[in-house]
Every structure is written in C-alpha cells, then in structure tokens.
Amino acid sequence: LVPHLGDREKRDSVCPQGKYIHPQNNSICCTKCHKGTYLYNDCPGPGQDTDCRECESGSFTASENHLRHCLSCSKCRKEMGQVEISSCTVDRDTVCGCRKNQYRHYWSENLFQCFNCSLCLNGTVHLSCQEKQNTVCTCHAGFFLRENECVSCSNCKKSLECTKLCLPQIENVKGTEDSGTT
C-alpha cells in the first residue's frame, strides 16, 4: 500500500531533494530557497534560478523552503516571566527562556511560564532544578512535602495525606507523654 501524501508532499516527492515542482508546470523542478530567504518568483524554466529574497526584519525561515512569505518572529511572553535568550535573525526564530534559578512550566505544548525553583527549606535537594522541571525535595524528619515545600508536621491534619509521613512523629509525641505518666 502507498502511504497517503498531501498535495504539497506529493508534488515535492517528484523532484530530487532540495527542489520542488513548479506550481504551473509539473515538468519543471525549481531549486528551493535557502533558510533566511523566501520564494519571490518560481524559476522560469529547467536549470534556471529561483528568485529568492531575504526575509525582512521581524521575520525568518529556519530551513530551505518555497514559502511565499517568511514567518513572523516569536515574541517572548513577559506576562509569563519569559526572557529573550537570543533575538530573531533571518534564519532563526527568537529563543525565549527563563531567568537563573527558574524553570519552565509548560501550560501547553507551545506555551510556558517561568517559576522560581524550590529551595527545599527544611529539607534537602533530591534532584536539582532543571530547565523544564522544578527541584525535587526530600523533607527532614518532622516535615512533610506539600506543594513541593517542606511543611512542619504540626500543620498536618488527620484528613491530609501527610498523616502517613508524620505518623512516626505523632507516635513519638504520644510515647513521650505515656512514659511521663508513672
């Protein structure tokens, strides 16, 4: 069985790599435009040059193409705490990231917000903060992990998950009280 190809893929597959089929004449293969440029005019005939023009400021193409327009440069989302790591060039989109001691939390595949890495106060760092993952903390005795922060077991309510983690602490308190009653 032949896999189903889209019209553009079908047209491109007729030509060798780095070339595309002329939209008005399927017997002509035109050379694709280099990254940083876009297609202004198709090649007039076989072996003749494709008219490619450089992308204007604020736009780019990151790979060889036969796009009629360059792509608009991305803008870093300040409201998400993003900062510009590298600015847009004709052949590369803007690279956005987070500040030092922050990590990216992806709200969707394409959208991230910067959050501060947890410091693991009253605990130790189990796994260091990564570009896309917060620090993983291990809490000291007498503390339990809640929302990636080490909270005192004195704040542990019976209904919360922490009862298991804080149980030895609770039993120790009871044991001390019991041993005092002779």
């Epitope: 709200w107 969707s108 595949e109 394409n110 959208l111 917000q113 929302e147 990636n148």
Partner: nanobody, 122 residues
C-alpha cells in the same frame, strides 16, 4: 466525548462577586491543566487564568491579578473561578478550556465549553 459545562454567570453590580464553575466529563480531569478564557463584546479572546493538574501552579492575567482566584476539585471533576471586586471591564463570556498537551499544532486549547455570560453593571 469531552464535555465542559460552565455555570454561575449572571448580572452583578460593580464591586460584587461571582463564582463560576465548570463541570468536566469524558476525560481524566485530574490529569490535565485547565483554564478560564474570556471574550468581551466585540473583542478578542483573553486568557484569564490557568491551573495545573494538581492545583498547585497558577497563572493570572495582569488585569485580574489579586481579584480572581482559580481552583479545582479533582474529586468532583470541577474547575472554579472566584471573581471578586468585579469591574465593568470584566463583562464578557467566560469559557472553561482544557489546555492542549500534545499534537497541538500551535493551538493552546483543545476543548472548550459553551461559555457563561458575566455582566457587570449598575
């Protein structure tokens, strides 16, 4: 079939409060990030607030920071938006949306509710 059903909208005076709810079904609600998005009359969509699957991390638009609170109850498959100190400019249709996690093709949301109208007027 994924369904998101908003409720709690209505007419409220400036300075008043409302609590919106969104009942989710047809997917594992507790495994996904959720959002509130609004559209004011004659305007484009505006992100209001996001919340992660566990209800720990949140995002708020500058226009609602300190006034709105997003929360969720995974045991009830419900998303909430507590809106306090409401202003005329908060008048909009409020949509509950599921944030897209894969094969998004530049979309940030893959499912939407029908919306609930919030009108802030004296």
């Amino acid at each position: 079939e994924v369904q998101l059903l908003e409720s709690g909208g209505g007419l409220v005076q400036p300075g008043g409060s409302l609590r919106l709810s969104c009942a989710a079904s047809g997917f594992t609600f507790g495994g996904y990030r959720m959002a509130w998005v609004r559209q004011a009359p004659g305007k484009g969509l505006e992100w209001v607030s996001f919340i992660d699957s566990e209800g720990v991390l949140t995002y708020y638009a500058d226009s609602v920071k300190g006034r709105f609170t997003i929360s969720r109850d995974n045991s009830k498959n419900t998303l909430y938006l507590q809106m306090n100190s409401l202003r005329a400019e908060d008048t909009a249709v409020y949509y509950c949306a599921k944030l897209c996690s894969s094969n998004c093709n530049m979309r940030n949301f893959d499912y939407w509710g029908q919306g609930t109208l919030v009108t802030v007027s004296s």
